[in-house]
């Protein structure tokens, strides 16, 4: 029961985590710029992995996708890659874990197969969570170091003058969503790995045979049961362990009028 609960909870936690990673990847608020007042109205800038947006105090919002793939910083490309890898691994992990759930019966799937699938999905969730955490952390480091920023300077560009304005970018909501989601996926993965240990059937290297002292009247009981004396207090006849799904104590024989000669 505890194994099923752990596996089920791990699945749900991972599901929430992966949904969060997807949400964070799609969000525009990875970095936000503090509100500043221009001569007209307050303008609020924010950027995501895919596009940059500007919102005015009037409510007007405009977003534009990043123009080129080759011109983007390597760090941004790396963050995109990490998030996408995290989503793909997480999605595959979810698919595998659905079939691995103990509460779902698919054909005559062995417990060992379910255990292996649970472990696989658990590892996938762990890697997925780590990818998301790494991606978000790399982006956060980009913001902290302000690698693209120089001090306010002026230079002549093509057809006019260009001035770089010193601005301060802060962590956007997507970063926190990503960190939490990555953590949840990681926790879910660990729970799946723990559940896997409980799912794996324990190997036994012996045959469970009951030995009894021979009595006066010994009867042969068909169906794989050992002989039993009519005198002993031990009336439970044990079935020889055949490596099947049933345990030793599952099949028991109780005395009947046919047991005695």
């Amino acid at each position: 029961m505890a194994v099923t609960a752990c596996q089920g909870l791990g699945f749900v936690v991972s599901l929430i985590g992966i949904a969060g990673i997807i949400a964070a990847t799609c969000m525009d608020q990875w970095s936000t710029q503090d509100l500043y007042n221009n001569p007209v109205t307050a303008v609020f800038n924010y950027q995501g992995l895919w596009r940059s947006c500007v919102r005015e105090s009037s409510g007007f919002t405009e977003c534009r996708g990043y123009f080129t793939l080759l011109g983007l910083p390597a760090m941004l490309q790396a963050v995109r890659a990490l998030m996408i890898v995290g989503i793909v691994l997480g999605a595959i992990g979810l698919l595998v874990s659905i079939f691995a759930l103990k509460c779902i019966r698919i054909g005559s799937m062995e417990d060992s197969a379910k255990a292996n699938m649970t472990l696989t999905s658990g590892i996938m969730f762990i890697v997925s969570g780590l990818c998301a955490i790494a991606g978000v952390s790399v982006f956060a480091n980009m913001l902290v170091t302000n690698f693209w920023m120089s001090t306010a300077n002026m230079y002549t560009g093509m057809g006019g003058m260009v001035q770089t304005v010193q601005t301060r970018y802060t962590f956007g909501a997507a970063l926190f969503v990503g960190w939490v989601a990555g953590g949840l996926t990681l926790i879910g993965g660990v729970m799946m790995c723990i559940a896997c240990r409980g799912l794996a059937p324990e190997e036994t290297n012996y045959k469970a045979v009951s030995y009894h002292a021979s009595g006066h009247s010994v009867a042969y009981k068909p169906g794989g049961f050992k002989a039993s004396t009519g005198f002993g207090s031990n009336t439970k006849n044990k079935k020889i362990y055949d490596g099947g799904a049933r345990t030793e104590d599952e099949v028991q024989s109780y005395p009947s009028k046919h047991d005695y000669v």
């Epitope: 009037s58 560009g157 770089t164 304005v165």
Partner: nanobody
């Protein structure tokens, strides 16, 4: 690289009209606001008018009735319609774009090369 190309300047008689335009091209991301500044001979740079992408406008005090600033968001083009021109409006007019590149390059102010408007009889 972003380029601003101005056009529409020239010689006009007092009381006449002119329409300046400024087309932005290149890798433009989030335009925060656009505007026109002017520099009269021997004087400093002064604000004429600014406009946001949302259409909020701001004019230098005594120009509001005569000058109209507008923009075409789809073409990234800025316009300045100047009516009832006076001799004191003679200046080099510069268009200005504040573009936010965010993580790709921060906040940058771009200025055009300037177009000369001469009001003379």
């Amino acid at each position: 690289e972003v380029q601003l190309v101005e056009s529409g300047g020239g010689l006009v008689q007092p009381g006449g009209s002119l329409r300046l335009s400024c087309a932005a091209s290149g890798n433009i991301l989030s335009i925060n606001y656009m505007g026109w500044y002017r520099q009269a001979p021997g004087k400093g740079l002064e604000l004429v008018a600014t406009i946001t992408r949302g259409g909020s406008t701001n004019y230098q005090g005594n120009l509001k009735g005569r000058f109209i600033i507008s923009g075409d968001n789809s073409k990234d083009t800025l316009y300045l319609q100047m009516n009832s021109l006076r001799a004191e409006d003679t200046a080099v007019y510069y268009c200005y774009f504040r573009i936010n590149f965010g993580i790709l390059g921060g906040l940058r102010d771009y200025w055009g090369q300037g177009t000369l408007v001469t009001v003379s009889s």
